[in-house]
């Protein structure tokens, strides 16, 4: 297969970093990280016609170049620039769904509503979803033992910088009405420190984006509160309004029914509020 050819061609031995080396507070690189990234790239480019011309070997070269031989607390957005370029993807800019602290439901939604896209529905997001990776300074080794934790070690680590970079670009590409799914079960429904709150909100382009529409997802079945009145949602509205983007908010009281109605909009029970 194409994947075997790639590994045959490069014959890279991915050694674990010896245990006596720097110990970080976070989990180490996901096992079989290079193979996983390449396999995901091949799969994605086979399924998505607009990305079929992308060379997965070059994508992997760009990915590893971003963090191999570099100190895992000193990664910059510039390190990821080649990967970002190769992963440039034209998604319908008016069909973007952002999310914060509610990834699974957002992904379930775009699996049904196929014309909408989360970041993880793009090549770069798909490659890295749920993976961890880091290297170490001046060696070509991948560290499978431990990687820096954002809070306990450093924020400029390979994983955090990657998601900050792709999230910024994803938000910059959005236009018209942008949707965001927020978790109404959390104490901070909108969290300024989340990727959405710290990166995406500030990189929506007012000249292209007309409205940000928040969908607040309720957790409890009997929860009939209007969570759009939550102070953190009001804070989000204020930030967005100051950026000359309109804001709207909807409560999704029954996420299970919401998904069902996306699948079957003709269902008679789908006319009532969900």
């Amino acid at each position: 297969s194409g994947l075997n050819d790639i590994f045959e061609a490069q014959k890279i031995e991915w050694h674990e970093v010896p245990r006596w080396r720097q110990q970080w507070s976070g989990p180490g690189t996901t096992k079989r990280f290079p193979e996983t990234v390449l396999a995901r790239c091949v799969k994605y480019t086979e399924i998505h016609p607009e990305m079929r011309h992308v060379d997965c070997q070059s994508v992997w070269d760009a990915f590893k170049g971003a963090f191999i031989s570099k100190h895992p607390c000193n990664i910059t957005e510039e390190d990821y620039q080649p990967l970002m370029k190769l992963g440039t993807q034209t998604v319908p800019c008016n069909k973007i769904l952002l999310w914060s602290r509610i990834k699974d439901l957002a992904h379930q939604f775009t699996q049904v509503q196929r014309d909408m896209f989360t970041l993880e529905d793009t090549l770069l997001g798909y490659l890295a979803d749920d993976l961890t990776w880091c290297g170490e300074f001046n060696t070509s080794k991948i560290n499978y033992q431990s990687c820096p934790d954002w809070r306990k070690d450093c924020s400029n680590n390979p994983v955090s910088v990657f998601w900050k970079t792709v999230s910024r670009r994803f938000a910059e590409a959005a236009c018209d009405v942008v949707h965001v799914m927020l978790n109404g079960s959390r104490s901070k429904i909108f969290d300024k420190n989340s990727t959405f709150g710290s990166v995406e909100v500030h990189n929506l382009q007012p000249e292209k984006v007309q409205t940000l529409e928040a969908w607040v997802i309720h957790g409890g079945r009997e929860d009939s509160r209007d969570l759009c009145q939550d102070p953190t949602i009001k804070e989000l509205e204020s930030i967005i309004s100051k950026r000359n983007i309109q804001f709207s908010c909807k409560n999704i009281y029954r996420p299970d029914k919401f998904l069902q109605c996306v699948k079957n909009p003709e269902d008679s029970s789908c006319t009532s509020e969900i």
């Epitope: 607009e50 070059s58 170049g65 080649p82 370029k85 190769l86 992963g87 440039t88 034209t90 800019c93």
Partner: antibody, heavy 121, light 110 residues
């Protein structure tokens, strides 16, 4: 001052090979994408290949150029190369190298160009 | 394959005229606005005029302006000057970092 200077063009028989060079000066070579673009006589522009070398070489090609054309870079000489094999009459063109604007808001655009080198097949 | 179609292919104008060139892409450009315009004079390399559809490149006179998004874009010269008679190319940026150029519009003296 940013300068790009192409060389290596000339007359070649169909099926032959040629290596073009693009010598760069006046900027930090490793921090920019260098793109090869060609223009057939009296025709429009067409991109060929791109290369970036922050640590290792990262390169990619227009679909039509894959297999026949290879881009490479010698950082010590501040030079990018375009190796062209199995040349055909339709490859006759002026070949330019260009530097892409840097920064993610500007990628995808070419701010500095060489004067071009003519390849005749 | 991505196609960028420019119209008209040739345009005759007098000094002071307002000129508009259209560029249509067969696919939406990256970010809805990742399109550039270049000016090329005979025997010379192209020169960047506009980027991101409507941003003027450094040193380009303000009589040049750009607009459009998605698949349809225009370059306007509000009042053509003698130095503006040249060929103009649009260029889009697409998935996977691919580039495509339009076929060109030659602006000649009437």
């Amino acid at each position: 001052e940013v300068q790009l200077l192409e060389s290596g063009g000339g007359l070649v028989q169909p099926g032959g090979s040629l290596r073009l060079s693009c010598a760069a000066s006046g900027f930090s070579f490793n921090n920019y994408w260098i793109i090869w673009i060609r223009q057939a006589p009296g025709k429009g522009l067409e991109w060929v290949a791109a290369i970036y070398s922050p640590s290792g070489d990262i390169k990619y090609y227009a679909d039509w150029a894959k297999g026949r054309f290879t881009v490479s870079k010698d950082n010590s000489k501040n030079t990018v190369y375009l190796q062209m094999n199995s040349l055909r009459a339709e490859d006759t063109a002026v070949y330019y190298c260009a530097r892409e604007l840097s920064g993610s808001s500007y990628e995808g655009y070419f701010e500095s160009w060489g004067q071009g080198t003519l390849v005749t097949v | 394959d991505i196609q960028l179609t420019q119209s008209p292919s040739t345009l005759s104008a007098s000094v002071g005229d307002r000129v508009t060139i259209t560029c249509r892409s067969s696919q939406s450009v990256y970010g809805h606005n990742w399109l550039a315009w270049y000016q090329q004079k005979p025997g010379k390399a192209p020169k960047l005029l506009m980027y991101r559809a409507s941003n003027l490149a450094s040193g380009v006179p303000s009589r040049f302006s750009g607009s459009g998004s998605g698949t349809e874009f225009t370059l306007t010269i509000s009042s053509v000057q003698p130095d503006d008679f040249a060929t103009y190319y649009c260029q889009g940026y697409y998935s996977g970092g691919a580039y495509a150029f339009g076929g060109g519009t030659k602006v000649e003296i009437k």
